[in-house]
């Protein structure tokens, strides 16, 4: 199926930028892995690079405004021609759900006191209003609540006195059109405008004051332009060469508004001064290699020794990583493929342990299923031996940091009948549904 092809993918927003054009295949668009595509206008934007997870979205608002609720966030597998970690296809959403609490308590309504006395009328002649008030304290609301209805009410009042009305001008009317629209005519062009004493008219009984000043004014028309000449397009110029050596590019033709040039405020030529076409080199663009994440550390060993576990003998271990995705003469990955460090092996060593404090509450699982729960733990944490934190392995090479490696066997006193982990679980409340914000299709 044809797609819309773009020259840029904006990682921060997940949007396609720089429309190249439509009607091309995904394979042609993605000859350049810096490009991106959309299956339809306004649809999901997918970059042409190999798939990886987007950044996590911000947490959605809490599902309730008071007491405990839940909130979701998501990230999307974006890219082309492959899968993200977890072996999922591009377009897939991964969700996280956590408990939240915007406000501990929920608002409670209050009640009104009785109405106070009426205040005096707001005017001394004709009709006005008077007001009375009441207090929201019977009882007072709690936790940011309020009382239903209004704290004051008003009613009409009549002083039985007639007020005089003074005249005031309505706004000026528009200027009448000038007698000519461009300069050089037989009569000097003039324009006039008028206004009425009607906003309001002065009263008769009791008598109001008339409007001050004149009801009309006149002026000479100035700055009339010479009569305008509309612009016209010249012919299209030659097609520019394809500006790229790989993937898709854009060629351009230009024309000039000079047949004739617009004069004296005449309109510029309608339409575009440039038009573009997609050009296809049919050559794939270079793809730089990207490091995979580091592999696991190898066991901590010392040459010519069977085992150094549970002993104050430093060893060495290494880990590696793979440069993936390099194609079509792209750059190799920068940096080292192997990482080496010094270590003490505590693999399967019986060590004295102590119980940790409670961990923070974990995420709610499953985020997209029924009855999600969250958990926290206390762990039997090993007390590490007091071995030297640095060693000098080779003369003249200075001190090297030494890291503990391996899974020891910590021993703690029993806690709630457990020797290694004590876990507490709680249900997550007011759980929202996992719904694709793009909602690709309903």
């Amino acid at each position: 199926d044809p797609v819309l092809c773009f020259t840029q993918y904006e990682e921060s927003s997940g949007k396609c930028k720089g429309l190249l054009g439509g009607g091309v295949s995904v394979e042609d668009c993605c000859l350049n892995t810096a490009f991106a595509y959309q299956k339809r206008s306004g649809g999901l934007c997918q970059p042409c690079r190999s798939p990886r997870w987007s950044l996590w979205s911000t947490w959605a608002p809490c599902s309730v405004t008071c007491s405990e609720g839940s909130q979701l966030r998501y990230r999307r597998c974006v890219g082309w021609n492959g899968q993200c970690s977890g072996k999922v296809a591009p377009g897939t959403l991964e969700w996280q759900l956590q408990a939240c609490e915007d406000q501990q308590c929920c608002p409670e309504m209050g009640g009104w006191s009785g109405w106070g006395p009426w205040e005096p009328c707001s005017v001394t002649c004709s009709k006005g209003t008077r007001t009375r008030r009441r207090a929201c304290n019977h009882p007072a609301p709690k936790c940011g609540g309020h009382c239903p209805g209004q704290a004051q009410e008003s009613e009409a009042c009549d002083t039985q006195q007639v007020c005089p009305t003074h005249g005031a001008w309505a706004t000026w009317g528009p200027w009448t059109p000038c007698s000519a629209s461009c300069h050089g005519g037989p009569h000097e062009p003039k324009e006039t405008r008028s206004r009425k004493c009607s906003a309001p008219e002065p009263s008769q009984k009791p008598p109001g004051k008339p409007c001050p000043g004149l009801a009309y004014e006149q002026r000479r028309c100035t700055g009339l332009p010479p009569c305008p000449v509309a612009g016209g397009w010249g012919p299209w110029g030659p097609v520019s060469p394809c500006p790229v050596t790989c993937g898709l590019g854009q060629t351009m033709e230009q024309r000039t508004c000079n047949h004739p040039v617009p004069q004296h405020g005449g309109p510029f030529c309608a339409g575009d001064a440039t038009r573009t076409h997609i050009c296809n080199t049919a050559v794939p663009c270079p793809v730089d290699g990207e490091w995979d994440s580091w592999g696991e550390w190898s066991p901590c060993i010392r040459r010519n020794m069977k085992s150094i576990s549970c002993q104050e003998i430093p060893g060495q271990q290494s880990r590696g990583r793979t440069c993936r995705g390099r194609k079509f003469d792209g750059h190799r990955c920068a940096g080292q493929q192997q990482d080496i460090r010094h270590c003490y092996s505590i693999q399967h060593c019986p060590l004295k342990g102590s119980w940790s404090e409670w961990s923070t509450w974990g995420l709610c699982m499953p985020p997209c299923g029924p009855n999600p729960t969250r958990a926290r733990q206390r762990l039997c944490t090993p007390l590490l031996p007091k071995y030297p934190p640095t060693v000098s392995m080779v003369e003249g090479q200075g001190e090297k940091n030494v890291t503990f490696w391996g899974r020891p066997l910590p021993r703690c006193e029993e806690l709630q009948g457990q020797k290694l982990v004590v876990e507490e679980k709680r249900p997550c409340l007011h759980v929202p549904a996992c719904k694709d914000p793009e909602e690709e299709e309903l």
Partner: nanobody, 129 residues
């Protein structure tokens, strides 16, 4: 363990309708995302329709959109595929699939057979012209 059993297939004329059912023994279907797939002889398995566990989103393949409808009856522990205006190219074995609640969602995810944990044995639909 969830066991899925499809029924409702058969031989029909082009333009006719069928209602396929997928019932379960064992656990309740209400907490699962459910999908229908089909496979014609000599062809790869193809996504047809899916619905999320709360039925907040429903997805269809372009080839069946507007003709097929996926729905469920939690009280009967059954998921349905209503197929209208059938065409000869709809001829295939139709399979029902269930996905344990997970942290993933989206059209791309539910279109992949690998996303589902349990499968039925299938029911044959044949459409003659």
């Amino acid at each position: 363990q969830v066991r899925l059993v499809e029924s409702g297939g058969g031989l029909v004329q082009a333009g006719d309708s069928l209602r396929l059912s997928c019932a379960t023994s064992g656990r309740t279907l209400s907490s699962y995302a459910m999908g229908w797939f089909r496979q014609a002889p000599g062809k790869e398995r193809e996504f047809v329709a899916a619905t999320t566990w709360r039925d907040t989103s429903t997805y269809y393949a372009d080839s069946v959109k507007g003709r097929f409808t996926i729905s469920r009856d939690n009280a009967k522990n059954t998921v349905y595929l209503q197929t209208n205006s059938l065409k000869p190219e709809d001829t295939a074995a139709y399979y029902c699939a269930a996905e344990e609640p997970s942290k993933y969602s989206g059209r791309s995810y539910y279109m992949m057979g690998a996303s589902y944990d349990y499968w039925g044995q299938g029911t044959q639909v044949t459409v003659s012209s």
